[in-house]
Amino acid sequence: KIDTPQRGSIQDINHRVWVLQDQTLIAVPRKDRMSPVTIALISCRHVETLEKDRGNPIYLGLNGLNLCLMCAKVGDQPTLQLKEKDIMDLYNQPEPVKSFLFYHSQSGRNSTFESVAFPGWFIAVSSEGGCPLILTQELGKANTTDFGLTMLF
């Protein structure tokens, strides 16, 4: 049983990486002297209590920054937010903290991240680039929901 977070780097199919800008994650083309974030991820320890066949439920954070990705409704709209939170505190909680959990599905080299709190909503970036990460229900051309996740050992 793994009880320390794994580290990884993420880019989308357009080779954009995730960068932290003013406490917001944005996707930008990789350039020299740029510092993409390193992702910290850990599987939910209560995996048996969550839906089967949707992917591996994980907590997603930014390595070394005590920031985790979470989903919350603003009005009627689920939104993606960064919250100050220790990923291991989430991991150790008595119950799955659904607002911070994502079903991680892999198909070949592509990964998707679906909100556990809001099924059908996925982490996405606008096809335009330089935009914040969002949650979307629309898996069409306007947004990219497929990411390449490379684990760092």
């Epitope: 048996e48 209590t49 969550l50 839906e51 939170k85 150790n92 909680q93 008595p94 119950e95 903290v97 659904k98 607002s99």
Partner: antibody, heavy 121, light 109 residues
């Protein structure tokens, strides 16, 4: 306003089964975890188990495995506790409680008023 | 299974500070026990006060605070009021189940 309304007192015979209900208003039970707790006079509280109404998955304290069955009906916003093979040891007040995440922690924040179960021949 | 022990009864006066504690038979209470504190008033009226050791539930007055003191979880009421007279239960998480204490009957005279 959040309210948990439990079913009325029950008097049942040893060996029988009983199903207690907890009807919730003011929030959707799919958005939280529902816990059940037993209270006997002078014996504190005992955790029976919990259910995630969003997927029906229940977890039990080992002491109550086989004795208690937790279910939930999201259409009526109601959680249920069924107790089987009743004995005098099951005579107690049973509470449902919401176990809810706010910002940085889980809390047993709202409780039902309790259902008194008496097992007697 | 672990046994969780609380003071059976405590008495305080209005305006005083009182601390209730919660001990585990399996060793020191830590933040991984996610201590919760609930209040019971007459007629089985329960209210959650503290979660995750030291987080106050929404709407709970600031005079209630949770902490770890030595090897125990603690609930401190700073400036007790007559309406705080109640039974207080702590609950500790042990990896896959909760164990509650027997409760502390607090009298505010």
């Amino acid at each position: 306003e959040v309210q948990l309304q439990q079913s009325g007192a029950e008097l049942v015979k040893p060996g029988a089964s009983v199903k207690l209900s907890c009807t919730v208003s003011g929030f959707n039970i799919k958005d939280t975890y529902m816990y059940w707790v037993k209270q006997r006079p002078e014996q504190g509280l005992e955790w029976i188990g919990r259910i995630d109404p969003a997927n029906g998955y229940a977890k039990y304290d080992p002491k109550f495995q086989g004795k208690a069955t937790l279910t939930a009906d999201t259409s009526s916003n109601t959680a249920y506790l069924q107790l089987s093979s009743l004995t005098s040891e099951d005579t107690a007040v049973y509470f449902c409680a919401r176990f809810h995440w706010y910002d940085s922690a889980f809390y047993f924040d709202f409780w039902g008023q309790g259902t008194t179960l008496t097992v007697s021949s | 299974q672990a046994v969780v022990t609380q003071e059976s009864a405590l008495t305080t006066s209005p305006g005083e500070t009182v601390t209730l504690t919660c001990r585990s038979s399996s060793g020191a209470v830590t933040t991984s026990n996610y201590a919760n504190w609930v209040q019971e008033k007459p007629d089985h009226l329960f209210t959650g006060l503290i979660g995750g050791t030291n987080n106050r539930a929404p709407g709970v007055p600031a005079r209630f605070s949770g902490s770890l003191i030595g090897d125990k979880a603690a609930l401190t009421i700073t400036g007790a009021q007559t309406e705080d007279e109640a039974i207080y239960f702590c609950g500790l998480w042990y990896s896959n189940h909760w164990v509650f204490g027997g409760g502390t009957k607090l009298t505010v005279l």
